[in-house]
């Protein structure tokens, strides 16, 4: 007698960060033969889908046509085979962006630095928010939190070539409602060849300030099941 079903994978397409009034699809992948999937939002039942026919479908999609702050929050899904329910999926944090204002992102000493230099990003927003978020774009996207009345600083410390990339910042009105993104700032880090070959794929940051959030590009999802499980997990908690 089967006692547990593996928890399903949950992710958002095209992304867990959704501009307001834009559409998003929450995907839940369980098992072939699953009779019913339930999507829960903030702990309450949000939607139900029953795949037809169950034996040929192992994934359902819940479509949100018009993203707004009421739809932003934590989602999870479960499925059942017969009357046996799976464990709940990991939590998916769905964030609404393009709320209210646009912050300004700057970098000191500048966008072109040498490996080993100390770099600090500054995110400024003159409206009422005290939390700011700095994101580095890419498949393995990092989110860092900062606090300040109108401006937050994000010290990266001595940088390596792994810090190279495009950064944006957001003002956050709550954990799941963010401002428009800032204009992107491209950080170029130059360093000698020996250093770059030893550089990690992603820089290591203090555990208390950095968490890894995998962006759910469609190609990434198809290639790597592990991505689904970690899509925007524990975001900002």
């Amino acid at each position: 007698q089967q006692q547990t079903l593996p928890k399903p994978f949950i992710w958002a397409e095209p992304h867990f960060m959704v501009p307001k009034e834009k559409q998003v699809t929450i995907c839940c992948q369980g098992n072939y033969g699953a009779v019913e999937y339930q999507l829960h939002f903030e702990g309450s039942l949000f939607a139900v889908d029953r795949p037809k026919p169950p034996e040929r479908i192992n994934k359902v999609k819940f479509y949100i046509p018009d993203m707004n702050s009421r739809m932003a929050g934590q989602y999870s899904c479960i499925y059942r085979v017969g009357e046996l329910w799976s464990e709940p999926s990991n939590l998916l944090d769905l964030v609404v962006t393009e709320m209210y204002d646009t912050p300004t992102l700057s970098v000191h000493p500048g966008p072109e630095v040498i490996s080993g230099e100390k770099v600090t990003f500054y995110c400024r927003l003159d409206t009422a928010t005290s939390m700011f978020l700095l994101l580095k774009e890419g498949r393995s996207s990092h989110v860092q939190r900062g606090y300040g009345k109108v401006q937050a600083e994000f010290p990266l410390g001595p940088v390596t070539t792994a810090h190279r990339g495009t950064y944006r910042c957001f003002g956050s009105y709550n954990n799941h409602a963010w401002s428009f993104p800032s204009e992107p700032v491209k950080l170029l880090v130059t360093g000698d060849i020996e250093n770059t070959s030893l550089a990690p794929e992603d820089p290591t940051f203090p555990a208390d300030t950095w968490g890894t959030y995998l962006l759910t590009t469609e190609t990434g999802l198809q290639k790597d099941h592990a991505l689904w499980d970690h899509t925007a997990q524990n975001l900002l908690r």
Partner: antibody, heavy 117, light 107 residues
Framework: QVQLVQSGAEVKKPGASVKVSCKAS????????MHWVRQAPGQGLEWIGY????????EYNQKFKDRTTLTADKSTSTAYMELSSLRSEDTAVYYC??????????WGQGTLVTVSS | DIQMTQSPSSLSASVGDRVTITCRAS??????LAWFQQKPGKAPKLLVY???NLADGVPSRFSGSGSGTDYTLTISSLQPEDFATYYC?????????FGGGTKVEIK
């Protein structure tokens, strides 16, 4: 072996409430949902709802939603069904039933609830 | 709600007879159907799940078939202990509903 042992028969007056217990043993209580089904004398079977003891999540038959509360105590592996505002037509045998991948695979022995003035 | 219509509501048969009970759902339930046997004063017992699968310990003279909206429980050779009431039940959506039952009596 799996066992669901229910509380004893109850006689209630119209308008009162009844709480039936179902003690589970022989399996991991939090791994399976617990459903409740009732059967009026000489009648068929009627599904009331279920609880997921792990999360406390419940789902009810609309017919019973306003008057029924399903709960579960993980520490004692016991599920409860409370039915309020009793009327004579609630006279029935109430069963707790384990929900598994095979459906309703184990049933309690039933609890007769009689509603009479 | 999905309605489950069971027929016949009762039948008389002799030991050794082949007995067929049918159940029709008001919509496609994709084989999410179970059959139960109930004897007087006892709780129902699971016989068949997912339309065609025999539950543990159920004799092979019982079999389930069907798909879509139409399902059948067959007892190939009726035994004395098979005289009981039989119910079908879907577990496709909410609420789960049962058929009205078929009482199998001795002829």
């Amino acid at each position: 072996q799996v066992q669901l042992v229910q509380s004893g028969a109850e006689v209630k007056k119209p308008g009162a409430s009844v709480k039936v217990s179902c003690k589970a043993s022989g399996y991991t209580f939090t791994s399976f949902t617990m459903h409740w089904v009732r059967q009026a004398p000489g009648q068929g079977l009627e599904w009331i709802g279920y609880i997921n003891p792990s999360s406390g999540y419940t789902e009810y038959n609309q017919k019973f939603k306003d008057r029924t509360t399903l709960t579960a105590d993980k520490s004692t592996s016991t599920a409860y069904m409370e039915l309020s505002s009793l009327r004579s037509e609630d006279t029935a045998v109430y069963y707790c039933v384990r929900g598994s991948s095979r459906g309703f695979d184990y049933w309690g022995q039933g609890t007769l609830v009689t509603v009479s003035s | 709600d999905i309605q489950m219509t069971q027929s016949p509501s009762s039948l008389s048969a002799s030991v050794g007879d082949r007995v067929t009970i049918t159940c029709r759902a008001s919509e496609n339930i994709y084989s999410n159907l179970a059959w139960f046997q109930q004897k007087p004063g006892k709780a129902p017992k699971l016989l068949v799940y997912a339309a065609t699968n025999l539950a543990d310990g159920v004799p092979s003279r019982f079999s389930g078939s069907g798909s879509g909206t139409d399902y059948t429980l067959t007892i190939s050779s009726l035994q004395p202990e098979d005289f009981a009431t039989y119910y079908c039940q879907h577990f496709w959506g909410t609420p789960r509903t049962f058929g009205g039952g078929t009482k199998v009596e001795i002829k």
